[in-house]
Structure formats: C-alpha cells, structure tokens
C-alpha cells in the first residue's frame, strides 16, 4: 500500500519545507485515494472482463451510488462553494458503506482497500473542518447501511464482482469531480 500523505520520503528529506495548507492537504489526500482506487481497479479488471463489458452485461443499475449533479454547485457553471462542499462531504459519507463492502473483496490488494477506506475517513474529517454549514450535512442511517451491506454481500459472485467494479468507477468519478471543485475554492 502506498504511504499516506505527509509520510513519504520527500517529507522526511525536506524538514524546512512550509507545512501544507488545509487546501493542499485535502488535494494531496484525494490524489492519494485516487492512486489507491487505480490499484484496486487494476486487480478487478485483471480478474475478469467486467471493466469492458459492464455496459452490455447490465440492463439496469440501482446501486444508487453518489453522483455529482448540476444542482450540487460543484461544476463551473453555477458553482456554489458552500452547496458543493456539503455535497462532497455528504457523498463521501454515503460512499463509506460501499467502501466497507470492498473490504475482503480483494486478494492481493487487501491492504490497499483498507488504505482507501481509512484515507477517506481522514478526508471527511479534513473537509468537515473546512465546512461552515455542518448542519446541512446528513449522515446516513447506520441501520439502513447495515441492511444494505447484508444485501450486497448476499449477491452471487458475478454480481459482487460487477458491484465492486461499479463502486470503484463511481468513487473515482466522484473524487475527480470533487478535486476539480475544491481547487476552485
């Protein structure tokens, strides 16, 4: 698993460097998570042909994974810092149950899956410090999440592989959109 942000050899070699700003730390954290997702996607795509065939193999996807929409204020047109930040935090909180599902779904990248999960928790904390309107952030219901997790884990092998692929793809897209939006803040 890659070394978490702030713990790489370059940081050790440059003790007099200015400490990272809050925005730089968030940016670095997201890029670190994206690297982790790339590694997990590599294992998933090597294991099966899910990555190329998901369009043809699926008629409908009702996983309800968080997605950026125009109304969320994260795109260049209609950009709204506060609304967007709430959406990013809410989306990441909603992704947590899916990241929990990803644990034990990888053979050679088990540590990587755990690193993505833990780094996302840290990212949420960073962003919550940045947000002014924490009241607008809705936390997913733990009972609903537990039920969702049980249903996801009850799927057959093929459906679980497809679910894994879809989660990783959606999480990557969500983080990339978040990164672009946060760079405008």
């Amino acid at each position: 698993a890659p070394v978490p942000p702030g713990e790489d050899s370059k940081d050790v070699a440059a003790p007099h460097r200015q400490p990272l700003t809050s925005s730089e730390r968030i940016d670095k954290q997201i890029r670190y998570i994206l690297d982790g997702i790339s590694a997990l996607r590599k294992e998933t795509c090597n294991k099966s042909n899910m990555c190329e065939s998901s369009k043809e193999a699926l008629a409908e996807n009702n996983l309800n994974l968080p997605k950026m929409a125009e109304k969320d204020g994260c795109f260049q047109s209609g950009f709204n810092e506060e609304t967007c930040l709430v959406k990013i935090i809410t989306g990441l909180l909603e992704f947590e149950v899916y990241l929990e599902y990803l644990q034990n779904r990888f053979e050679s990248s088990e540590e990587q899956a755990r690193a993505v999960q833990m780094s996302t928790k840290v990212l949420i904390q960073f962003l919550q410090k940045k947000a002014k309107n924490l009241d607008a952030i809705t936390t997913p219901d733990p009972t609903t999440n537990a039920s969702l997790l049980t249903k996801l884990q009850a799927q057959n092998q093929w459906l679980q592989d497809m679910t894994t692929h879809l989660i990783l793809r959606s999480f990557k897209e969500f983080l990339q959109s978040s990164l672009r939006a946060l760079r405008q803040m």
């Epitope: 043809e56 193999a57 699926l58 008629a59 409908e60 996807n61 009702n62 996983l63 249903k151 996801l152 009850a154 799927q155 057959n156 092998q157 093929w158 459906l159 497809m162 679910t163 879809l166």
Partner: nanobody, 125 residues
Framework: EVQLVESGGGVVQPGGSLRLSCAAS????????MGWFRQAPGKEREFVST????????YYADSVKGRFTISRDNAKNTVYLQMNSLRPEDTALYYC??????????????????WGQGTLVTVSS
C-alpha cells in the same frame, strides 16, 4: 431457494404468437429480477429479455425487440413472455431465470441464481 417452472411452449407457424409463463415458488418473488434466456440446438444459451423487480421496465435482445414483451405479476409469482411475429430462428428451449441481486439487472447468465428446466418453442411451417 426458488423453484421455477416454465410453460406455454409448443409448435407454431412463422408469424404466429405464443405466451410463455414462469411460475416461481417462494414468498420473496417481488425482490427477484426475472429473465428469459434461450438455447437453440447446437448453439450457446443467449439472453432474450429481463424485467426489474417492480415490473416497471423490460429489456430485450436486439433480435427480439419489438416482437417480444416481458411482464410480471408479483401477486401471482409469475413472469410472462409474450412472443409475436415468431420466426424459425426463434426455435429454441426457453429458460426462465431469477436473480437475487437486489440492485443490478443482468443481461448475462452469470448474474442469475436460479433456473427453470425450460420449455420448447418450435417455429415451423
């Protein structure tokens, strides 16, 4: 555990119609995605049609689009395949399948958990 029993197959002339039924045992029928697949002699099994849990949306293979209609009656634990304008190339053993996924509606056999024994459809003049 779900048991699936197909019926409605038979011999029909080109251009004719048939309605296949698939009765499912089990109380949780409405939570299953239901699909129809077919296997012609000497060929691989292929996707025909699938319908989501609510019955609000059906999906079809290009070869049957506009001719076949899938529907379900959750109160009767039954899924139907209405086949119109039948062609000789529709001749096959038709299988009903159930997917306990709960989130995804698959077009491929690997996405389904339970299968019926099949009902034979022969289109011939």
């Amino acid at each position: 555990e779900v048991q699936l029993v197909e019926s409605g197959g038979g011999v029909v002339q080109p251009g004719g119609s048939l309605r296949l039924s698939c009765a499912a045992s089990g109380r949780t029928f409405s939570s299953y995605v239901m699909g129809w697949f077919r296997q012609a002699p000497g060929k691989e099994r292929e996707f025909v049609s699938t319908i989501n849990w609510a019955g609000s949306r059906g999906y079809y293979a290009d070869s049957v689009k506009g001719r076949f209609t899938i529907s379900r009656d959750n109160a009767k634990n039954t899924v139907y395949l209405q086949m119109n304008s039948l062609r000789p190339e529709d001749t096959a053993l038709y299988y009903c399948a159930a997917s306990a996924g709960g989130f995804l509606v698959p077009r491929v056999g690997q996405g389904y958990d339970y299968w019926g024994q099949g009902t034979l459809v022969t289109v011939s003049s």
